[in-house]
């Protein structure tokens, strides 16, 4: 079974409705908003999580220089269209027939258009740069300890294999975590870096998506690591297509 059998809940996604109506009376959980069945033994896709979030009550809310093609999610929340596997559909539209193309993490990668806009494929985000600023501490964290603890966090909490944590950079108080995962590297059962980054982002904001699991308590050699700012950059396998007007704005 994929959910906690005894009390029929979804450990990895609290934005679900669960009931023992699966095969053989097993616990089955469905994401809010989409009603899609989710695998509670792993992370739920970001698309289904965003859809669930939009359906929930509204009160529930050496350093690397990002490449010129890096995307930041400036558009904020929207109610996405997800495919049958829970991935973002390449084309997203709002209720007023304004459409745009997104990448595999659901971030807009083209100018907005109308219903005639074509998005031929879902472009994969293969490199994510998580930029954190930590609160002041007595001294700087030891870089190798910080690196090891963050790799451990992504493996232990988000199931992301250490090979996908490409690097951890640190210049006090800024920490940068680089996640890399090409299409060819991602095997069956591997967590997507986009999903891991989203769970991490929500954890950092104190909005954990896990059911019953404690909030994020990140420590480096016993010293609490408290984050006060997060910025996430997304790099796609194919550069985004924006007009010059946006680039000079």
């Amino acid at each position: 079974h994929t959910a906690a059998q005894d009390n029929c809940t979804c450990p990895t996604n609290k934005m679900t409705v669960c009931s023992p109506d699966g095969p053989g009376g097993r616990c089955q959980c469905r994401a809010l908003g989409s009603g899609m069945a989710v695998d509670c033994s792993t992370l739920t896709s970001k698309c289904l999580l965003l859809k669930a979030r939009m359906s929930a009550p509204k009160n529930a809310r050496t350093l690397v220089r990002p490449s010129e093609h890096a995307l930041v999610d400036n558009d904020g929340l929207y109610d996405p269209d997800c495919d049958p596997e829970g991935r973002f559909k390449a084309r997203q539209c709002n209720q007023t027939s304004v459409c745009w193309c997104v990448n595999s993490v659901g971030v807009r990668r083209t100018d907005k258009g109308d219903l005639s806009l074509r998005c031929d494929e879902l472009v994969r985000t293969h490199h994510i740069l998580i930029d954190l600023r930590h609160r002041p501490t007595a001294g700087a964290f030891n870089h190798s300890d910080l690196d090891a603890e963050l790799r451990r966090l992504f493996r232990e909490r988000y199931r992301l294999h250490p090979k996908f944590v490409a690097a951890v950079h640190y210049e006090q108080p800024t920490i940068q975590i680089e996640l890399r995962q090409n299409t060819s590297q991602k095997a069956a059962g591997d967590v997507d870096i986009g999903d891991a980054a989203y769970y991490f982002e929500r954890d950092i904001k104190g909005e954990s998506l896990f059911q019953g699991r404690g909030g994020l308590d990140l420590r480096v050699r016993g010293e609490p690591l408290q984050v006060e700012r997060t910025l996430i950059y997304y790099l796609d396998e194919i550069p985004p297509k924006f007009s010059m007007k946006r680039l000079t704005a």
Epitope: S41, R151, P162, K163
Partner: antibody, heavy 120, light 107 residues
């Protein structure tokens, strides 16, 4: 001193069930990923299953998926392996093993093992 | 799944010899490789992790090398207590696999 002590092995008929236990001591059990590894008589080592520190993330080898269930009780410093629908090829010494702290899945400490024999 | 192939399956060498055991992965595993020693009738013991790093308490005559698909465990000067079966294991993916083992004996 790190100690891992397995129990629960024995003789069971094909199709039967068995529950193995592992009592851990000498380290902070609740912060380590744990695994079961088995070794058929006179054969090599085979990884069976992994469970992360808080029990949320679990992996199984293809050979036992759907039949075996790994679990843990951090309050009791214990690791378990529930084995159902046992087959003759499951006959082996089952080792309780600790994964490295930083969640790389190699095994830094091994228990003495408990023998499971599946035979009619 | 990634297959691990060790060679030779068995070998016999004299005390003081330099001994080399190889392990080949069916696909790239970077340096996500460990080596274990299992003495007759005993429990396996970690020797090497991350392909080249010596585990605590392991004598310096043991060393590991390699990256990608080809790896080597070397014993620089064989001692009588090194009689054992040696296993490699990858941890590059979620499906962990061991090599079939190399049995080392003293001539």
């Amino acid at each position: 001193e790190v100690q891992l002590v397995e129990s629960g092995g024995g003789l069971v008929q094909p199709g039967g069930s068995l529950r193995l236990s592992c009592a851990a001591s000498g380290f902070t059990f609740s912060t380590y990923t744990m695994s079961w590894v088995r070794q058929a008589p006179g054969k090599g080592l085979e990884w069976v299953a992994n469970i992360n520190s808080d029990g949320y993330n679990i992996y199984y080898s293809d050979s036992v998926k759907g039949r075996f269930t790994i679990s843990r009780d951090n309050a009791k410093n214990s690791l378990y392996l529930q084995m159902n629908s046992l087959r003759a090829e499951d006959t082996a010494v089952y080792y309780c093993v600790r994964c490295s702290y930083y969640s790389y899945d190699y095994f830094d400490y091994w228990g003495q093992g408990t023998l499971v024999t599946v035979s009619s | 799944d990634i297959q691990m192939t060790q060679s030779p399956s068995s070998l016999s060498a004299s005390v003081g010899d330099r001994v080399t055991i190889t392990c080949r992965a069916s696909e790239n595993i970077d340096n996500y490789l460990a080596w274990y020693q299992q003495k007759p009738g005993k429990v396996p013991k970690l020797l090497i992790y991350a392909a080249t790093n010596l585990a605590d308490g392991v004598p310096s005559r043991f060393s590991g090398s390699g990256s990608g698909t080809d790896f080597t465990l070397t014993i620089s000067s064989l001692q009588p207590e090194d009689v054992a079966t040696y296993y490699c294991q990858h941890y590059y993916s979620n499906q962990l696999t061991f090599g079939q083992g190399t049995k080392l004996e003293i001539k």
